[in-house]
Interface confidence: medium
């Protein structure tokens, strides 16, 4: 039977407001609202917490019965939808011990694990996996790319009691490995032997100058020489123009700097590798994965452009249950969500096309009207001129 420590799907209307607590650490934290957004797969099931104010910090958390993950697997899972086409903002969660004062949660509140997507401009599009180990926040050494489109995505972190981990996006593995290898929790197992140094006669040169090679006697030639084809102009006046000097040209016989040919170095020993020894500072920690106490899940974020929706939170000890839960929530509505978005996009495109067409027709009608007015004006002018001509007496007409 899986242990479900925390599950939140926001299926009871405003009920969430009694389970989630706003931090009062700052007076101007952004407000979360319950919404399924502008497009969705299922209007009710896809309701989640949506950030609603631009350029704000958000600090909201929910508590649950405290538990320890010692000796068992920990799975943290939730969905994130950046329907605002996010440019800078967090989409991650923090797991805190139950000692957290939820009304005072803020960016420096000590957490156990931080996990989830983070986007900021073109430079940051990553999934954070940060563990607090002995009071220090330790970041993963790998770059895990997050999704940056407008659709809902499922993020899963699995931490196992054998000190291995797995990160999944949309129920597909994107990263896995060992905690010890992929984070710098512990000092390195091996260090360079401080007592070892490269022997003085160690030769790392693969090639050397051939000692038998010597520069040919006719090698050294000037780089530039007077142009042998140049002639002094006939009108050159040495008194007036000074002594005539032919222009210089590149010497075709110039060979540049002579270098002896290279041969294999008979004394070459290869690159010296500093020998390593076991690091006396290193001692394995089989319980890196373990925390005594989890009691609060928090959203502690900054967003430039609001609109992100968080939903389908799950903390459990059962990987299979989490996968199943993901498929029953995100999995069931993702296709319909895309369908609705595509339909909206198509409607928008048609609307814009229609507006363009209408505008062009109006412009053409205006142009036509202008042309007709112009034609009428020209006809009026001609009629006017004819009338004036008819009014002029005969003899005066000849004089005109």
């Amino acid at each position: 039977e899986p242990a479900v420590y925390f599950k939140e799907q926001f299926l009871d209307g405003d009920g969430w407001t009694s389970r989630w607590i706003e931090s009062k650490h700052k007076s101007d934290f952004g407000k979360f609202v319950l919404s399924s957004g502008k497009f969705y797969g299922d209007e009710e099931k896809d309701k989640g917490l949506q950030t609603s104010q631009d350029a704000r910090f958000y600090a909201l958390s929910a508590s649950f019965e405290p538990f320890s993950n010692k000796g068992q697997t920990l799975v943290v899972q939730f969905t994130v939808k950046h329907e605002q086409n996010i440019d800078c903002g967090g989409g991650y969660v923090k797991l805190f011990p139950n000692s957290l004062d939820q009304t005072d949660m803020h960016g420096d509140s000590e957490y156990n694990i931080m996990f989830g997507p983070d986007i900021c401009g073109p430079g940051t599009k990553k999934v954070h996996v940060i563990f607090n180990y002995k009071g220090k926040n330790v970041l993963i050494n790998k770059d895990i790319r997050c999704k940056d489109d407008e659709f809902t995505h499922l993020y899963t972190l699995i931490v196992r009691p054998d000190n291995t981990y797995e990160v999944k996006i949309d129920n597909s593995q994107v990263e896995s490995g060992s905690l010890e290898d992929d984070w710098d929790f512990l000092p390195p197992k091996k260090i360079k032997d401080p007592d070892a140094s490269k022997p003085e006669d160690w030769d790392e040169r693969a090639k050397i100058d051939d000692p038998t090679d010597s520069k040919p006697e006719d090698w050294d030639k000037p780089e530039h020489i007077p142009d042998p084809d140049a002639k002094k102009p006939e009108d050159w006046d040495e008194e007036m123009d000074g002594e005539w000097e032919p222009p210089v040209i590149q010497n075709p016989e110039y060979k540049g700097e002579w270098k002896p040919r290279q041969i294999d170095n008979p004394d070459y020993k290869g690159t010296w590798i500093h020998p390593e020894i076991d690091n006396p500072e290193y001692s394995p920690d089989p319980s890196i994965y373990a925390y005594d106490n989890f009691g609060v899940l928090g959203l502690d974020l900054w967003q430039v452009k609001s609109g992100t929706i968080f939903d389908n939170f799950l903390i459990t000890n059962d990987e299979a249950y989490a996968e199943e839960f993901g498929n029953e929530t995100w999995g069931v509505t993702k296709a319909a969500e895309k369908q609705m978005k595509d339909k909206q996009d198509e409607e928008q495109r048609l609307k814009e096309e229609e507006e363009d067409k209408k505008r062009k027709e109006e412009e053409e009608a205006e142009d036509k009207e202008d042309d007709e007015d112009k034609d009428e004006d020209e006809e009026d002018e001609e009629d006017k001129e004819e009338d004036e001509e008819e009014d002029v007496p005969g003899q005066a007409k000849d004089e005109l």
């Epitope: 910090f57 800078c88 900021c120």
Partner: nanobody, 116 residues
Framework: QVQLQESGGGLVQPGGSLRLSCTAS?????FGWYRQAPGKQREFVAN???????RYSDSVKGRFTISRDNAKNTVYLQMNILKPEDTAVYYC?????????????WGQGTQVTVSS
């Protein structure tokens, strides 16, 4: 600690232009301009990242241009074809990010009034 200083606000006729400046001290991940009209929520106008990518709100697209002088650590907002609805206090924002931590800093605001 990042200090921000805005300037360039004022009274301008509809259709006119203004250029706002914001000078910062410190290392910035993103600069943004926001505005707040009387009785309304503060709203996003434009922002620019260190990498150079830029974003505008739909209401100012094509009229406003954000730019940055890295040597002076200054960000500008060139506002053209101003409309009465652009009247607001304009705030400069600087975002400093470090390993999942965010700190944002705000200027004191500069008033822009568009009126004939």
């Amino acid at each position: 600690q990042v200090q921000l200083q805005e300037s360039g606000g004022g009274l301008v006729q509809p259709g006119g232009s203004l250029r706002l400046s914001c000078t910062a001290s410190g290392s910035i991940a993103a600069f943004g301009w926001y505005r707040q009209a009387p009785g309304k929520q503060r709203e996003f106008v434009a922002n620019m990242y260190v990498g150079g990518s830029i974003r505008y709100s739909d209401s100012v697209k094509g009229r406003f241009t954000i730019s940055r002088d890295n040597a002076k650590n200054t960000v500008y907002l060139q506002m053209n074809i101003l409309k009465p609805e652009d009247t607001a206090v304009y705030y400069c924002n600087a975002l400093v990010r470090f390993e999942g931590r965010n700190d944002d800093y705000w200027g004191q605001g500069t008033q822009v009034t568009v009126s004939s």
